[in-house]
């Protein structure tokens, strides 16, 4: 990896697990006030592979609210508005980092967690399953 | 919001900015070893709105590597394999949390940052702008 010269103004860490446990400032830097994906764009409705957004809430996690996409159909919407089953609506998934309270219910102690979320759907040519 | 009873086993915080500054364990909990989205699925290639994945690396950020999707076409691929400009390929974006080293180059001090990433592309019916 890239070696970064250490800044002499860094906080000291007396934690025996250093650098596994770090200090994190929760004042979000690049904050974007638009947290509801339904407001950010209407792609979920205009897509040929439309999706619904489900609210997933967990007070033990930061962020506590995550929106999960679920494709509406097996196929994709064609020009006539019908579902074309020669194509497939599939979820686009992404691994994201969240903070999990650890020990549970602690306000100031977290552990990084990777979770897989479905962000939206896309229309793909299917892999045809042949009968054995 | 939901009030969580505090666990008596929580670490104490003497930080005057508490609870803004918290301790985070970087041992990722639900780790998924497959970090290269190209390996996780070939949707980016099979989609009617295909995309390329660009590696975005920043040693001052955790995770340091993030993959960004860029739609290959303005239109969508039709059944004949041609680009249909009556439809639009658009990026599906998601706000994600990352850790930004703060002060810079510090190994054990971070600030939460929200960034907007393009995860993949979807094919949408365009909004037609009529001339007044």
């Amino acid at each position: 990896g890239i070696t970064i010269p250490r800044n002499p103004g860094c906080p000291n860490s007396e934690d025996k697990n250093f650098p596994r446990t770090v200090m994190v400032n929760l004042n979000i830097h690049n904050r974007n006030t638009n947290t509801n994906p339904k407001r950010s764009s209407d792609y979920y409705n205009r897509s040929t592979s439309p999706w619904n957004l489900h609210r997933n809430e967990d007070p033990e996690r930061y962020p506590s609210v995550i929106w999960e996409a679920k494709c509406r159909h097996l196929g994709c919407i064609n020009a006539d508005g019908n579902v074309d089953y020669h194509m497939n609506s599939v979820p686009i998934q992404q691994e994201i980092l969240v903070l999990r309270r650890e020990p549970p219910h602690c306000p100031n102690s977290f552990r990084l967690e990777k979770i897989l979320v479905s962000v939206g759907c896309t229309c793909v040519t299917p892999i045809v399953h042949h009968v054995a | 919001g939901i009030t969580i009873p505090r666990n008596p086993g929580c670490p104490n915080s003497e930080d005057k900015n508490f609870p803004r500054t918290v301790m985070v364990n970087l041992n990722i909990h639900n780790r998924n070893t497959n970090t290269n989205p190209k390996r996780s699925s070939d949707y980016y290639n099979r989609s009617t709105s295909p995309w390329n994945l660009h590696r975005n690396e920043d040693p001052e950020r955790y995770p340091s590597v993030i993959w960004e999707a860029k739609c290959r076409h303005l239109g969508c691929i039709n059944a004949d394999g041609n680009v249909d400009y009556h439809m639009n390929s658009v990026p599906i974006q998601q706000e994600i949390l990352v850790l930004r080293r703060e002060p810079p180059h510090c190994p054990n001090s971070f600030r939460l940052e929200k960034i907007l990433v393009s995860v993949g592309c979807t094919c949408v019916t365009p909004i037609v702008h009529h001339v007044a």
Epitope: N45, R72, L74, I77, G81, V83, N88, V128 | V124, T125
Partner: antibody
């Protein structure tokens, strides 16, 4: 003309599995998806899932997830619906229906689950 | 999942009368991008499979008499039979095709008064 002919009535014991077939004729089988719908005696209709006869991909009603399997054999233009771990409340007439909105339906297969 | 509610449960009418059946969904079935409502109506007679009458809320399936008409948008839909014929006495179901699972209403029985 389009025809969907389903297999005959079945009597099964709780815990067993049943596989219902739906043979299609009068059209190109892989051009239309096949939906499966059931109807308990004196009750309404319940959508179980759909199979793309072209790709074999499926979408199941979560209620039946883990118990239902939909397959097809394109060489004989036949769709299948298998329901496992049968319970008495699975007693129903099971229908296959062609296309987006069920423009054509099979005659139905009565499955009775009884000990 | 989307919940479909039909009313009334039973409709008692005479041949020649007008029948108005209602179907309400727990969320909008209108896809704003193509302005289509993903709702279908079916007729079922005793011992028979259902028969498709209407799709996209108002499009009549081929071969369906024009006395059957569908209307409505969003969450409120209506099936109208302008003049009841003896063969129209049956159970009618609405079904949403907006999002899986594609749920049905509980049905409205149109019986002879």
């Amino acid at each position: 003309q389009v025809q969907l002919v389903q297999s005959g009535a079945e009597v099964k014991k709780p815990g067993a599995s049943v596989k219902v077939s739906c043979k299609a004729s009068g059209y190109t089988f892989t051009d239309y998806a096949m939906h499966w719908v059931r109807q308990a005696p004196g009750q309404g209709l319940e959508w179980m899932g759909v199979i793309s006869t072209y790709s074999g991909n499926t979408n199941y009603n979560q209620k039946f997830k883990g118990r239902v399997t939909m397959t097809r054999d394109t060489s004989i233009s036949t769709a299948y619906m298998e329901l496992s771990r049968l319970r008495s409340d699975d007693t129903a007439v099971y229908y296959c229906a062609r296309g987006n909105y069920g423009s054509d339906w099979g005659q139905g297969t009565l499955v009775t689950v009884s000990s | 999942e989307i919940v479909m509610t039909q009313s009334p449960g039973t409709l008692s009418l005479s041949p020649g009368e007008r029948a108005t059946l209602s179907c309400k969904s727990s969320q909008s079935l209108l896809n704003s991008s193509n302005q289509k409502n993903y709702l279908a109506w079916y007729q079922q007679k005793p011992g028979q499979a259902p028969r498709l009458l209407i799709y996209f809320a108002s499009t009549r399936e081929s071969g369906i008499p024009d006395r059957f008409s569908g209307s409505g948008s969003g969450t409120d839909f209506t099936l109208t039979i302008s003049r009841l014929e003896p063969e129209d006495f049956a159970v009618y179901y609405c079904q949403q095709h907006y999002s899986t699972p594609y749920t049905f209403g509980q049905g409205t029985k149109v019986e002879i008064k």
